[in-house]
Interface confidence: medium
């Protein structure tokens, strides 16, 4: 080993060196949080870049650059360091038009903390491992969601467009002429029945166990879907989103109530099955895989 390499190895394995890098990263993160940084912070930025460059040079001199098994670029954690340095010099010395977009990559410096703190390294390692192991569970989840989305599509397509429409029309008014002239929320409230405080017209259905309209109103299928048109089973993609919402239990009771009002109470069976299989089983299966991966990484 050359004297330069010996010195580099000594520096690299020294605990003070790790401490210096950790402190640098944390200080850098503090500076990054500043709203309107003063002019002198520019010099501090250069100092940080210098320390990161020094760290990488020490690692390259001690371990080699890329040829050989344990060299600098063979460790994925060093890829992050390399990218951070490259972007630091790019944003500083190369005129690249929209620099603000490139400046975003400075945030990657915060991720350097992971490679320095051993506990964090373990957790992130487990996270990456769990993502690899999750592929099968993800395929199963997407498959199950797709199957239920197709069932939902067949059962509820167009149902959420059912609305309670006012009976007393003017002589020459038609549903089409009304829908063409409706512009504001106020116009809609004139013709459709709204519950107090609701932003969507009251849903209804044509089956005996679905929601009925109050006196003076008839159930019609017209207009857009609830929640600005985002809640529906009208296409596979919207149905898939609705099923994902059920699986994650994201305000799912609202979707459940809307659908049951428009389609009928019998369809609660569909929701019971989806919640049990999707929300209780699949979500916990995902958590189990993550837990297993973390356990393996710890060992």
């Amino acid at each position: 080993f050359s004297p330069l390499r010996r010195i580099s190895i000594k520096i690299l394995v020294h605990s003070l060196f790790s401490m210096l890098i950790m402190c640098t990263i944390l200080t850098n993160c503090i500076f990054m949080t500043m709203n309107n940084p003063p002019d002198w912070t520019k010099n501090v930025e250069y100092t940080f870049t210098g320390i990161y460059t020094f760290e990488s040079l020490v690692k390259i001199l001690a371990r080699g650059f890329c040829v050989g098994e344990f060299t600098f670029l063979r460790d994925p954690w060093n890829w992050l360091d390399f990218v951070v340095i490259v972007f630091a010099y790019l944003t500083e010395f190369v005129n690249l038009g929209n620099v603000s977009a490139l400046r975003t990559f400075r945030v990657l410096r915060a991720l350097k903390t992971i490679s320095v703190i051993p506990g964090l390294k373990t957790i992130v390692g487990a996270l990456i491992q769990s993502v690899k192991k999750l592929s099968d569970v993800m395929i199963l989840t997407v498959f199950c969601l797709s199957v239920f989305a197709l069932i939902g599509l067949q059962l509820f397509m167009g149902n959420l467009k059912h609305k309670c429409f006012r009976n007393s029309l003017e002589n020459n008014e038609t549903l089409e002429s009304i829908m063409n002239t409706l512009e504001s929320e106020e116009d809609f409230r004139k013709y459709f029945y709204y519950l107090e405080g609701s932003k969507d017209a009251l849903l209804c259905g044509f089956s005996t166990d679905s929601g009925q309209c109050p006196e003076g109103y008839t159930c019609v299928k017209i207009g857009r879907n609830p929640d600005y048109g985002y809640t529906s089973f009208d296409t596979f993609s919207w149905a898939f989103l609705a099923l994902f919402r059920l699986m994650t239990q994201d305000y799912w009771e609202n979707l459940y109530q809307q659908t049951l009002r428009a389609a009928g109470k019998t369809y609660m069976i569909f929701f019971v099955v989806v919640i049990f299989l999707g929300s209780f089983y699949l979500i916990n299966l995902i958590l189990a895989v993550v837990a297993m991966a973390y356990e393996e990484q710890n060992q």
């Epitope: 429409f165 009976n167 008839t218 159930c219 299928k221």
Partner: nanobody, 120 residues
Framework: EVQLVESGGGVVQPGGSLRLSCAAS????????MAWYRQAPGKQRELVAY??????ISYADSVKGRFTISRDASKRVYLQMNSLRPEDTALYYC???????????????WGQGTLVTVSS
């Protein structure tokens, strides 16, 4: 395509009765609301009566107590007209708000009209 066909019109003496019927032909998934309108010569079209699937019924003030609207389980609506007066002379139209197919929107459909003449 959905079509509404009216029948039962004709000439009747004042005080007489007529029964108009309207049937929907073609693909009909769901009938939401059926109504009878009339247009007397030189006048605007006006609502006579309507019936909804829930049994909600309404009549124009001029025909209350004399006319009766009803619908059956099939795609038909009827207008029973009693104690007819000369001012009831008009072209009677049937109108329905209906959904032709399960995935289509509710639309407004009109019949061609049937003429009712009340004259002595």
């Amino acid at each position: 395509e959905v079509q509404l066909v009216e029948s039962g019109g004709g000439v009747v003496q004042p005080g007489g009765s007529l029964r108009l019927s309207c049937a929907a032909s073609g693909p009909v998934f769901n009938i939401n609301r059926m109504a009878w309108y009339r247009q007397a010569p030189g006048k605007q079209r006006e609502l006579v009566a309507y019936v909804t699937p829930t049994g909600d019924i309404s009549y124009a003030d001029s025909v209350k107590g004399r006319f009766t609207i009803s619908r059956d389980a099939s795609k038909r609506v009827y207008l029973q007209m009693n104690s007819l007066r000369p001012e009831d002379t008009a072209l009677y139209y049937c109108r329905a708000l209906l959904q032709p197919r399960r995935y289509s929107n509710t639309r407004t459909y009109w019949g061609q009209g049937t003429l009712v003449t009340v004259s002595s």
